[in-house]
Amino acid sequence: EEELQVIQPDKSVLVAAGETATLRCTATSLIPVGPIQWFRGAGPGRELIYNQKEGHFPRVTTVSDLTKRNNMDFSIRIGNITPADAGTYYCVKFRKGSPDDVEFKSGAGTELSVRAKPSAPVVSGPAARATPQHTVSFTCESHGFSPRDITLKWFKNGNELSDFQTNVDPVGESVSYSIHSTAKVVLTREDVHSQVICEVAHVTLQGDPLRGTANLSETIRVPPTLEVTQQPVRAENQVNVTCQVRKFYPQRLQLTWLENGNVSRTETASTVTENKDGTYNWMSWLLVNVSAHRDDVKLTCQVEHDGQPAVSKSHDLKVSAHPKEQGSNTAAENTGSNERNIY
């Protein structure tokens, strides 16, 4: 009779993570008598996957009933496959021996490859806010995928970005892989509502890429522009001065009025108005009793925005000249200057 052969008909098997792998093996003869064992890998370090004779292998089931006398099908199923299960599996026939069974013949091996989906991309922005015209870096990470081939793209508001660097780790063999990418984004004043998107495409996703997003509202700081103006006279000897704080983001803002360098009032932006681009406007006013001042008054609107160094604008009230006419005329503007004179 022809010598027993162990046949593993599949050179390779490709299985998605979480699914069941079927590893096929048949023997061409019932002789010699002895059990079958399955191993992952070859040589002295091989890992026992299934032993027909003894042991507990909760993830492994046999395709046919190995207790039947004439059975020659030794195929197995391995459940809940993970990337860590990848490798070459050998079906090995043992001959009954005393005291131990003796390895008789091995199949040619079946390489199990596992397809695993990448994790949802995680996008991280800079730790500190940055102002328009600055370049900031965003990182995108995804883990646990197999095979290694993967495509990563960056978008800002739907427009693909080109300034980024991507690495897949490791560069050689592994049961699964990780991807890391860093993109550079130039901020503009209109970016409060902008989004940065990292898109990952992989064979396991069947054309439906995974996306991670970051809102630039968490990254950008738009500093305010200040304008100090004098309003028409409200009552005799009283002047209303306003400080327009425009186009700032985020909302955290504190304003201090100074009269000749002395703090007059401090307030925190509360009832702001929102612009279409997501920035905010706010106005503060100060009522100045001109008659209480002998000399010219220097009014300063000082704004501290989002913990940054204060910015300020000043306005000069002339109170010494022509006091009798004070309040009768509107302010004369010097174009390009924030000085206002009362005659």
């Epitope: 883990h143 646990g144 660097q165 690495n167 490791p170 860093t182």
Partner: antibody
Framework: QVQLQQSGAELAKPGASVKMSCKAS????????MHWVKQRPGQGLEWIGY????????FHNQKFKDKATLTADKSSTTAYMQLRSLTSEDSAVYYC??????????????WGHGTSITVSS | DIVMSQSPSSLAVSVGEKVTMSCKSS????????????LAWYQQKPGQSPKLLIY???TRESGVPDRFTGSGSGTDFTLTISSVKAEDLAVYYC?????????FGGGTKLEIK
């Protein structure tokens, strides 16, 4: 400056578990993967695995997949490794070491001083 | 897994001498896309933790004296110390970071005569 401060030596009984810590300072904790390496007395180095502190993702040397559990706490910038079902084979010094995952995948550039684990009944 | 083999396992040299040690990998560590070799060298002095000397097979880590030089490509790598100092007494390990699991060589112990 960069520092990886590891917890002190431990004596444990066979079958028990131990959890060691690695406190990172002097750099952005989430910008580096934290690797763990085993060194048995008078022996060479053996890579256990790593954790990405920013996502919590872990990757193990298959040899240690049932032995070591890696975790990280971003708020305290500390990485942890728990070893379970201890045997005499687990008696070793365990190092944490950081690795830049940025524009280039470098090797492990800073190492902790190591935590010595002795397993004895 | 990639097997890393170092030789010799130990060597004794006098201060001022040049020393070379070898590291071989069971498969190439050269990544064709960026032409980099994913190999590092570490120095471990008695009672201390390992210290990175060389990465990318030949790039010296900042602060490492220029008497340490890494060379080689593919599967054969060398660490050279041009003029040994007494403070170089240590075990030197090579490590591949080309594939997971990362693997180390068995080390070369440098002793001073």
């Amino acid at each position: 400056q960069v520092q990886l401060q590891q917890s002190g030596a431990e004596l444990a009984k066979p079958g028990a578990s131990v959890k060691m810590s690695c406190k990172a300072s002097g750099y952005t904790f989430t910008s580096y993967w934290m690797h763990w390496v085993k060194q048995r007395p008078g022996q060479g180095l053996e890579w256990i695995g790593y954790i990405d502190p920013s996502t919590g993702y872990t990757f193990h040397n298959q040899k240690f997949k049932d032995k070591a559990t890696l975790t990280a706490d971003k708020s305290s910038t500390t990485a942890y490794m728990q070893l379970r079902s201890l045997t005499s084979e687990d008696s070793a010094v365990y190092y944490c070491a950081r690795r830049d995952y940025g524009s280039s995948f470098y090797a492990m550039d800073y190492w902790g001083h190591g935590t010595s684990i002795t397993v004895s009944s | 897994d990639i097997v890393m083999s170092q030789s010799p396992s130990s060597l004794a040299v006098s201060v001022g001498e040049k020393v070379t040690m070898s590291c071989k990998s069971s498969q190439s560590l050269l990544y064709s896309t960026n032409q980099k070799n994913y190999l590092a060298w570490y120095q471990q002095k008695p009672g201390q933790s390992p210290k990175l000397l060389i990465y990318w097979a030949s790039t010296r880590e900042s602060g490492v004296p220029d008497r340490f030089t890494g060379s080689g490509s593919g599967t054969d790598f060398t660490l050279t110390i041009s003029s040994v100092k007494a403070e170089d007494l240590a075990v030197y390990y090579c490590q591949q970071y080309y594939s997971y699991p990362w693997t180390f060589g068995g080390g070369t112990k440098l002793e001073i005569k």
